[in-house]
C-alpha cells in the first residue's frame, strides 16, 4: 500500500480466482484513543472499532472511503484504491490502446517546435467518475523539471455503438534550449482514476521524435504562362522553431482529386515554392517535416486547383 | 593552428554538401545496424545515450545561431558568449566564434573518426563478420574533415590487446552510431545557418 | 494485371511520319497518366512527354515540341504517339509507360523498334 | 534541363558482391529521384521511387538513398538475375530527364 495523496491509499493487488488479497492497517488520523467506529462508504454498518482498522482488502467491494467516527462526528478519511496486476501484468482498462505507432501504446505526444513544449492524449470509453493526473520530468534518475497543466476532455467521438473521449495535456519543459541534443529522455506518467480503480500509465521520448511541424501556412498559386504548370509557394508555420535557417523544413507538394485512388502529382522541395501540374476539381497540397531528423510529416495545407 | 577563412563565401565552402553526405552516411549505418543487429539492443529506446565528446568539445554552445542567445537555457554551459555590446556583435567577433564552431566540429569528427576506425578493427575480427563500418561513412567524415582545413595533432588510433568482447562491441558501435546521427543533424543545421548567413 | 501492349515494329524514310500505339488493360485508362519515352541503340532513355487520358492534357520534353503529337482514346482504351519530320537520328525503340503518379514510371509497354532509313 | 550523371558506365562483379552505383543530379532535386533496372530486349522496371522508398515486389536487397544532388543504388548481395543497366530518372522539373545509364557486367 501507498499513498497516492492525502488521505488517498492504492493497494496493489494481485488478481486472480481466489487470491488472498492485502492486509490493510487503517490508522484514524485523531488525538482520541477510545469510543472510535469505522465506516466504509455511505453504509452505517460499523466494520470495528478503535484507534486502527484492520482489514483485507481482496475486491473492489473492500475498497472505497473508509471513515472513523467518534459520537456522530468524523475524525478522518482514507480512501483506499485498488491497482490490479493479473499474470504480473498491470492492469490497463481505462484507457485505450492506440496501437500507433506500436501496440500497448496509450499515451501519445508531439510537439510543434523545439521549445520544450509538448502536448500528450489518450483515449478512453468512459464518461463518468474520472480523474487524471499528469507528471513530467526529463530523466528519471536525476529528473530536471518539467510542468505539465490539468489534463482536460479536449475532444468526444462517436465510434460505432460507443463513444470516445480524448483527453489531452500540455507541458512545457522548465529550462529547454531549442539546439540542445537530447541525451535524457522526457518521461511522462499519468494517474488515471476510475470509481476505485487505480492505474498508471508512462511514456518516455526525447522531443526531436515526437516532433510535429504545424502545416505551412499562407498557400499561394500563380499560373504559368502557356503552361498546364502552377507555382504554388508557401511560408513556414508560426510554431517552427527559429531561425529557420538552423531549423530547416523540407516539403512534400501534392496535386491530387477528392479519392486519394485517383492519380495525382507529387513533388518533394526544401524551398518554399514548387512547380506542379493542376487539374481540374484536383487541391493543392503541402506538409511540412524536418529536414534533418525524419520525425513526422505535418497535416497537409490545402487549395483548390481552379 | 590553421583556422579557415571566416566569411561565408557563396557556397558556405563544400562544407553544406559534405554535411549533407555526413548525415545521410550516419543514418544509412545506423539503419544498416539496426537491421543487421536485430537481437541487439540497438534502438534509441534501448541504448544508453552517450556522448564520447562530451567535455571535450562543446559544438552546441560554439555554434549556437545568433537567435538563440538570448535564450538563458542556452548560455548555461557557454565559456564564450555571442553577445558583445549589449545584443549587437562586432565582426571580428562573429569570426572568432564562427573559426571557433568549426573547429569544433572537426574535433568531433577526429573523435569519432578515431573511435569508428578503433571498432572496424575490432569487428574485422570477429568469426561471425556478422557487421562492419561503410567505408563510404569513414570518407565521408575524412572529406567533411578536408573541407573543413583544420591542422590539429592526429590522435593515436586506440589499440587494446586483450580480446575484444564483440557482443559488447557491437552495442557500442549501436551507441556511437545515435550519437553520431544527432551530432551530425546538429553539424548540417550549423552549416545550413552559416550558408544563410 | 496492369498491362500495356503496343504495335508493332515500324520502318519509316527520313520525313515521313510514325505513329504507334499503347493499348491499355487491367486498369481504367484514365485513372493513369502516360507517358512516352524512348531509347536509341545502345543509348540511355529519353523522356519525351505524357498526356492525362482523363482530359486530353499534355506536356511535351522542349526538344519535341512540333514534331510530337500524344493522343489518347478512352472509348478503345489506347494511346498514341505520333513523331513527324522523321530523321535517322529518331531510330530508337519507343515505350509507352503508366502511372498514378505524373513523374516517374511504374508499368511499360514491351516497346516498339523504329527504324528510320533511307 | 536537369542533367543527370551517373557513374561508373560500367561495373564488373560477381554474385555475392555488394554494388553501388552513384547519380549526381546538375541542380539540387531534393528526393525526386528514382531508379530503374533493364534487362537487353525488355523494358525498364521501377526499382526505387523518391531516393529511398522500396517498390512491392522488388528484393530488399536493392536500396537508394541521397538527397539534395548526390544519390546512390546498393545491390547488397548481387544475384545472377542483377546483372543488367541501371538508370536513375529525376522528377524534379520537366522535362523529366535519365542518367546515362551504369551496365552491371558479371566478372
Known amino acids: 500500500i501507498w499513498e497516492l495523496k492525502k488521505d488517498v491509499y492504492v493497494v496493489e493487488l494481485d488478481w486472480y480466482p481466489d487470491a488472498p488479497g492485502e492486509m490493510v492497517v487503517l490508522t484514524c488520523d485523531t488525538p482520541e484513543e477510545d469510543g472510535i467506529t469505522w465506516t466504509l462508504d455511505q453504509s452505517s454498518e460499523v466494520l470495528g472499532s478503535g484507534k486502527t482498522l484492520t482489514i483485507q482488502v481482496k475486491e473492489f467491494g473492500d475498497a472505497g472511503q473508509y471513515t472513523c467516527h467518534k459520537g456522530g462526528e468524523v475524525l478522518s478519511h482514507s480512501l483506499l484504491l485498488l491497482h490490479k496486476k493479473e499474470d504480473g501484468i498491470w492492469s490497463t482498462d481505462i484507457l485505450k490502446d492506440q496501437k500507433e505507432p506500436k501496440n500497448k501504446t496509450f499515451l501519445r505526444c508531439e510537439a510543434k517546435n523545439y521549445s520544450g513544449r509538448f502536448t500528450c492524449w489518450w483515449l478512453t470509453t468512459i464518461s463518468t467518475d474520472l480523474t487524471f493526473s499528469v507528471k513530467s520530468s526529463r530523466g528519471s534518475s536525476d529528473p530536471q523539471g518539467v510542468t505539465c497543466g490539468a489534463a482536460t476532455l479536449s475532444a468526444e467521438r462517436v465510434r460505432g455503438d460507443n463513444k470516445e473521449y480524448e483527453y489531452s495535456v500540455e507541458c512545457q519543459e522548465d529550462s529547454a534550449c531549442p539546439a540542445a541534443e537530447e541525451s535524457l529522455p522526457i518521461e511522462v506518467m499519468v494517474d488515471a482514476v476510475h470509481k476505485l480503480k487505480y492505474e498508471n500509465y508512462t511514456s518516455s521520448f526525447f522531443i526531436r521524435d515526437i516532433i510535429k511541424p504545424d502545416p505551412p501556412k499562407n498557400l499561394q498559386l500563380k499560373p504559368l504562362k502557356n503552361s498546364r504548370q502552377v507555382e504554388v509557394s508557401w511560408e513556414y508555420p508560426d510554431t517552427w522553431s527559429t531561425p529557420h535557417s538552423y531549423f530547416s523544413l523540407t516539403f512534400c507538394v501534392q496535386v491530387q482529386g477528392k479519392s486519394k485512388r485517383e492519380k495525382k502529382d507529387r513533388v518533394f522541395t526544401d524551398k518554399t515554392s514548387a512547380t506542379v501540374i493542376c487539374r481540374k476539381n484536383a487541391s493543392i497540397s503541402v506538409r511540412a517535416q524536418d529536414r534533418y531528423y525524419s520525425s513526422s510529416w505535418s497535416e497537409w495545407a490545402s487549395v483548390p486547383c481552379s | 593552428r590553421n583556422l579557415p577563412v571566416a566569411t561565408p563565401d557563396p557556397g558556405m565552402f563544400p562544407c553544406l554538401h559534405h554535411s549533407q553526405n555526413l548525415l545521410r552516411a550516419v543514418s544509412n549505418m545506423l539503419q544498416k545496424a539496426r537491421q543487421t543487429l536485430e537481437f541487439y539492443p540497438c534502438t534509441s529506446e534501448e541504448i544508453d545515450h552517450e556522448d564520447i565528446t562530451k567535455d571535450k568539445t562543446s559544438t552546441v554552445e560554439a555554434c549556437l545561431p545568433l537567435e538563440l542567445t538570448k535564450n538563458e537555457s542556452c548560455l548555461n554551459s557557454r565559456e564564450t558568449s555571442f553577445i558583445t555590446n549589449g545584443s549587437c556583435l562586432a565582426s571580428r567577433k562573429t569570426s572568432f566564434m564562427m573559426a571557433l564552431c568549426l573547429s569544433s566540429i572537426y574535433e568531433d569528427l577526429k573523435m569519432y573518426q578515431v573511435e569508428f576506425k578503433t571498432m572496424n578493427a575490432k569487428l574485422l575480427m570477429d568469426p561471425k563478420r556478422q557487421i562492419f563500418l561503410d567505408q563510404n561513412m569513414l570518407a565521408v567524415i575524412d572529406e567533411l574533415m578536408q573541407a573543413l582545413n583544420f591542422n590539429s595533432e592526429t590522435v593515436p588510433q586506440k589499440s587494446s590487446l586483450e580480446e575484444p568482447d564483440f557482443y559488447k562491441t557491437k552495442i557500442k558501435l549501436c551507441i556511437l552510431l545515435h550519437a553520431f546521427r544527432i551530432r551530425a543533424v546538429t553539424i548540417d543545421r550549423v552549416m545550413s545557418y552559416l550558408n544563410a548567413s | 494485371e496492369v498491362q500495356l501492349v503496343q504495335s508493332g515494329a515500324e520502318v519509316k524514310k527520313p520525313g515521313a511520319t510514325v505513329k504507334i500505339s499503347c493499348k491499355a488493360s487491367?486498369?481504367?485508362?484514365?485513372?493513369?497518366?502516360l507517358h512516352w519515352v524512348r531509347q536509341a541503340p545502345e543509348k540511355g532513355l529519353e523522356w519525351m512527354g505524357w498526356?492525362?487520358?482523363?482530359?486530353?492534357?499534355?506536356e511535351y520534353a522542349p526538344k519535341f515540341q512540333g514534331r510530337v503529337t500524344i493522343t489518347a482514346d478512352t472509348s478503345t482504351d489506347t494511346g498514341y504517339l505520333e513523331l513527324s519530320s522523321l530523321r535517322s537520328e529518331d531510330t530508337a525503340v519507343y515505350y509507352c509507360?503508366?502511372?498514378?503518379?505524373?513523374?516517374?514510371?511504374?508499368?511499360w509497354g514491351q516497346g516498339t523498334l523504329v527504324t528510320v532509313s533511307s | 534541363d536537369i542533367q543527370m550523371t551517373q557513374s561508373p558506365s560500367s561495373v564488373s562483379a560477381s554474385v555475392g558482391d555488394r554494388v553501388t552505383i552513384t547519380c549526381r543530379a546538375s541542380?539540387?532535386?531534393?528526393?525526386?529521384l528514382h531508379w530503374y533496372q533493364q534487362k537487353p530486349g525488355k523494358a525498364p522496371k521501377l526499382l526505387i521511387k523518391?531516393?529511398?522508398q522500396s517498390i512491392s515486389g522488388v528484393p530488399s536487397r536493392f536500396s537508394g538513398s541521397g538527397s539534395g544532388t548526390d544519390f546512390s543504388l546498393t545491390i547488397n548481395s548481387l544475384q545472377p538475375e542483377d546483372f543488367a543497366t541501371y538508370y536513375c530518372?529525376?522528377?524534379?522539373?520537366?522535362?523529366?530527364?535519365f542518367g546515362g545509364g551504369t551496365k552491371v557486367e558479371i566478372k
Open positions: 509507360a503508366a502511372n498514378k503518379e505524373l513523374r516517374y514510371f511504374d508499368v
Open positions: 487491367g486498369y481504367t485508362f484514365s485513372d493513369y497518366y
Open positions: 498526356i492525362d487520358p482523363e482530359n486530353g492534357d499534355t
Open positions: 541542380q539540387s532535386i531534393s528526393i525526386n
Open positions: 523518391f531516393a529511398s
Open positions: 530518372q529525376q522528377s524534379n522539373s520537366f522535362p523529366l530527364t
